[in-house]
């Protein structure tokens, strides 16, 4: 359904007018403005930026712009007692110490308040012991170490390379393996692309560069002290011992120069295979401990960071809808950064700023969207998605009744190769249709659509002739909206070529070198990719807020539900004997998926035929579409993860960044052959099939004719 039928406007105020108003030069200017000093969550600088954004959004023409503050648990290094790691000899003397800070980039030597590299929420401690190299510290890496190589990490300090999975999962895995400390480092194999120079001469990570980041395992809880409820002025706070998701062992990140010094002395077992070798000139021995001459030397961590309840500020802007003001389309991205935030988050925040300006321009000319649009500048995302989660907890009753969609707007770029989209299946058709109308910014695709370049460069692995659209996982501010509240969500950014660049994320992620110049010199000098991302994000918001019929297609959910059911059944069928022994049947799930398919198609038929001039029927049909995502929410949540309530999707238990389908069944089946009580384990599989089948069937029934 085209948006040209937008409410009480002249014909020129359509999607085209909105898109034409978006300007690359403005995004560039906003990015520069947002990246001149650090904006660490909980600091005065980030509060000042919040007030600046509030003021500018008001100037742009939003109806209201408010600050929403919360007092949440944050973590900072001790300014007078720095964190570091040393190699000590048998007398306890420190014969090598890791660096205390990153060498500042040119032009930033005199900037104050650059937080040194640290692992946020690490407990204090000074453990010492032998080192064990654990590759990426993934579940499968510890399986390899413990089961195949018979290497015990208990009482050891483990060193893991960043990449592949969320760092919090690495720490959790190390804890479960009995480690007493974790050292995280960036290996050039993952953070140094061949043929590219280090910053400031290119976009690669220099040896002194370090990735900061939180190491929580919150599982969607938000503020660790107030899970489920907003951290407001009358909040009851848990004691630190009962806080959600805090690590129990000291953790610290280092760069590859320092990692070289630790790894070059490693002895013990050789790496099990080539997948455990990085690109440093070291043997990548697993350990435990150092080799021959250095066997009496140990590693010692010195961690003195503190956890502090600190005030954070979200900026919430409102553009009231003309026809359905009680239906909310939300565009949100975070404002807080580890240092300058050249990519994360300010390349996203600059795009949001320009989208707000464009909407404001239309509003000043007399236009309003059909539905209300909420714009959010979230705080403390880097500390565990805290700002967005607390606001959603505070407003959960409104959101679950009125929330149409949430579009996330963190980093606009992580490369300049092609588009990357993760979203609910309800938005597939919206994304396809929109990208077919936008021009590709890619070289060699002049005059071609974004859809065409995207499909060519990032084809769907399952469906030929279509672009890849991924499942939503977590690690960003959509989490509470999608995984907890069941609000249809999506995200879009420009990405790298995953085929040729095997490094994880982008090399300078969360380092001091993530500057304005990094973007302007190396990633997007013309800001054309930023503009394209603004068009995609803004275009999605425009359509969601303005289409007479919501641009959701329930038939696409039917397609993926079948695919996911097939996939989880195939995983289960790796255990045919146990399936028989314990009478495990997927019939109920497959039946529910078929019913969903049938009902979704009938609903789509009615959607094409109903009288759109009847406001009651229109609202009824739109509500069925809006509430479909909500219907996949189980109020009881997933086992041991009460804030992950979506039955079809959840962040992987092994990698927060990745999405898993039918996560309840998947987790019940995971490593089931090693469970001590197979009867109980397969009983849980059966229970999860039951929950999934019931949920899919219940969701299908929400699409049935109402009477």
């Amino acid at each position: 359904k085209s948006s040209n039928e937008a409410t009480n406007i002249t014909p020129k105020h359509n999607m085209k007018a909105f898109l034409d108003e978006l300007k690359a030069e403005n995004i560039k200017k906003f990015l520069y403005n947002f990246t001149q000093i650090p904006h660490l969550a909980g600091t005065e600088q980030n509060f000042q930026l919040a007030k600046q954004i509030q003021s500018q959004w008001k100037e742009f023409g939003l109806d209201s712009v408010e600050l929403a503050h919360y007092d949440v648990l944050l973590s900072y290094p001790n300014k007078t007692h720095p964190n570091y790691i040393s190699i000590i000899n048998e007398d306890g003397n420190e014969i090598f110490n890791t660096s205390l800070f990153e060498p500042p980039p040119p032009g930033y030597e005199n900037v104050s308040d650059i937080v040194p590299p640290f692992s946020a929420f690490s407990p204090q401690g000074m453990p010492e012991g032998d080192l064990v190299y654990v590759n990426y510290a993934r579940t499968e890496d510890f399986f390899k170490l413990e089961r195949d190589m018979k290497i015990n990490c208990s009482g050891k300090i483990v060193i893991a390379r960043y990449g592949k999975v969320f760092r919090g999962n690495k720490v959790k895995n190390a804890q479960l393996a009995g480690a007493k400390g974790v050292i995280l480092y960036s290996d050039p194999a993952d953070y140094f692309a061949p043929g590219v120079k280090s910053y400031p001469d290119g976009w690669n990570l220099p040896g002194g560069g370090v990735q900061r980041g939180n190491i929580l395992n919150l599982n969607g809880a938000g503020d660790p002290l107030t899970p489920g409820y907003p951290a407001n002025e009358y909040a009851y706070r848990r004691g630190i011992a009962e806080a959600v998701g805090l690590p129990s062992i000291p953790v610290h990140p280092i760069g590859y120069y320092d990692a070289q010094k630790l790894l070059e002395k490693m002895g013990g077992s050789a790496p099990p295979d080539s997948s455990w070798r990085g690109s440093l000139k070291v043997p990548y021995n697993v350990g435990p401990g150092f080799t021959g001459n250095f066997s009496t030397q140990k590693v010692k961590m010195h961690i003195h960071s503190t956890n502090e309840v600190t005030r954070i500020y979200n900026v919430i802007g409102t553009l009231r809808g003309a026809v359905e003001p009680d239906r909310y389309v939300i565009l949100g991205g975070h404002r807080d950064s580890w240092v300058f935030g050249g990519i994360d988050p300010q390349s996203g925040a600059a795009v949001v700023h320009e989208i707000v300006r464009s909407f404001g321009t239309l509003k000043k000319e007399g236009w309003r969207p059909r539905r209300t649009i909420l714009f959010a500048s979230w705080d403390a995302e880097e500390f565990g998605l805290l700002g967005s989660t607390e606001w959603a907890e505070e407003n959960s009753r409104l959101l679950q009744e009125r929330g149409v969609a949430y579009i996330n707007a963190d980093s606009s770029i992580e490369g300049n190769y092609t588009l990357r989209v993760d979203c609910t299946p309800l938005m597939y058709s919206l994304v396809h249709n929109l990208t077919k109308e936008l021009k590709s910014p890619d070289e060699g695709f002049e005059g071609k659509s974004l859809y065409e370049s995207w499909t060519k460069k990032s084809p769907s692995p399952e469906f030929s002739g279509m672009p890849r659209i991924s499942k939503l996982g977590s690690g960003n501010d959509f989490e509470v909206f999608f995984q907890r509240l069941g609000i249809a969500s999506g995200r879009a950014r420009y990405t790298k070529n995953w085929e040729t660049n095997k490094f994880s994320g982008y090399p300078l992620y969360h380092s001091v070198y993530e500057t304005y110049e990094l973007v302007e010199k190396f990633y997007d000098p013309m800001f054309k990719y930023h503009l394209t991302v603004a068009q995609v994000r803004g275009g999605m918001v425009f359509e969601l807020a303005n289409s007479i019929v919501l641009p959701f297609d329930c038939r696409d959910y039917a397609v993926v539900l079948r695919k996911y059911a097939d996939k989880i059944y195939s995983i289960s069928m790796k255990h045919p004997q146990e399936m028989k022994t314990y009478s495990v049947s997927f019939d109920s799930l497959f039946s529910a998926v078929k019913n969903f398919t049938e009902i979704a198609s009938k609903f789509s038929e009615r959607l094409q035929d109903f009288d759109k001039s009847n406001p009651i029927v229109l609202r009824m049909m739109n509500d069925q579409l809006m509430f479909l995502e909500r219907a996949f929410i189980d109020p009881l949540g997933l086992p041991d993860r009460p804030f992950y309530r979506h039955v079809i999707y959840a962040p992987s238990s092994h990698n927060k960044y990745a999405g898993e389908s039918f996560p309840g069944i998947y987790d019940a089946l995971f490593d089931i052959e090693s469970k001590v009580d197979p009867s109980k384990a397969w009983g849980e599989v059966k229970r999860q099939i039951y929950v999934a089948a019931f949920t899919v069937q219940a969701a299908a029934e929400t699409l049935s004719e109402v009477a």
């Epitope: 597939y428 058709s429 038939r555 039917a558 497959f590 078929k594 398919t597 198609s601 094409q608």
Partner: antibody, heavy 121, light 110 residues
Framework: EVQLVESGGGLVQPGGSLRLSCAAS????????MSWVRQAPGKGLEWVSA????????YYADSVKGRFTISRDNSKNTLWLQMNSLRAEDTAVYYC??????????????WGQGTLVTVSS | QSVLTQPPSVSAAPGQKVTISCSGS????????VSWYQQLPGTAPKLLIY???KRPSGIPDRFSGSKSGTSATLGITGLQTGDEADYYC???????????FGGGTKLTVL
């Protein structure tokens, strides 16, 4: 009443291309998965390809993957099969079939009359 | 070689009963719904049974379907000469992400 009418068959040389069409009427075309099923002379039915309702996710038999492309135009109620790099073993009557459930293939409740494709030099 | 296995032919006298078997695996018949099609000589196939055992309107109750484990069966009672045709079973295969058919069974009414 539901009607499916195939066209575009004919004689083509090995390595050549052909585009089959299927004009649909009598139902809400966009809501249903559509398939192509073929039958070589004197042989059984062989499913070739399907396209879902909604955005049109595609599925192919291994024997045609990379050579055939299924597509649909919901505004025109038309299904297509673009056949490239044709081989002698692709000779068959090609049927267009509608799914009886919805957006993904379950069973075929309506079939076209078929169009003959002959690949021969 | 078809993914689903059917007998190439069956025969019976008019008025008799006949069954046609269709054997598959856990990834197709074992978990998915089976349908049956009748193809009279020189015509397009016609849906006979869907969802293992349901008949579309217009199909007489002489035709029945059943499924057990990884096999399905089509039953025809009160055979008539007009039933002479090829019969195909079909289903989805969850591993292949594809529709699969049996090789077909030729029914001869003696």
């Amino acid at each position: 009443e539901v009607q499916l009418v195939e066209s575009g068959g004919g004689l083509v040389q090995p390595g050549g291309s052909l585009r089959l069409s299927c004009a649909a009427s009598g139902f809400t075309f966009s809501s249903y998965a559509m398939s192509w099923v073929r039958q070589a002379p004197g042989k059984g039915l062989e499913w070739v390809s399907a396209i879902s309702g909604g955005i049109g996710s595609t599925y192919y038999a291994d024997s045609v993957k990379g050579r055939f492309t299924i597509s649909r135009d919901n505004s025109k109620n038309t299904l297509w099969l673009q056949m490239n790099s044709l081989r002698a073993e692709d000779t068959a009557v090609y049927y267009c079939a509608k799914d009886g459930v919805g957006a993904t293939p379950y069973y075929f409740d309506y079939w076209g009359q078929g169009t003959l494709v002959t690949v021969s030099s | 070689q078809s993914v689903l296995t059917q007998p190439p032919s069956v025969s019976a006298a008019p008025g008799q009963k006949v069954t046609i078997s269709c054997s598959g695996s856990s990834s197709n018949i074992g978990i998915n719904y089976v349908s049956w099609y009748q193809q009279l000589p020189g015509t397009a196939p016609k849906l006979l049974i869907y969802d293992n055992n349901k008949r579309p309107s217009g199909i007489p109750d002489r035709f029945s379907g059943s499924k057990s484990g990884t096999s399905a069966t089509l039953g025809i009672t009160g055979l008539q000469t007009g039933d002479e045709a090829d019969y195909y079973c079909g289903t989805w295969d969850s591993s292949l992400s594809a529709v699969v058919f049996g090789g077909g069974t030729k029914l001869t009414v003696l």
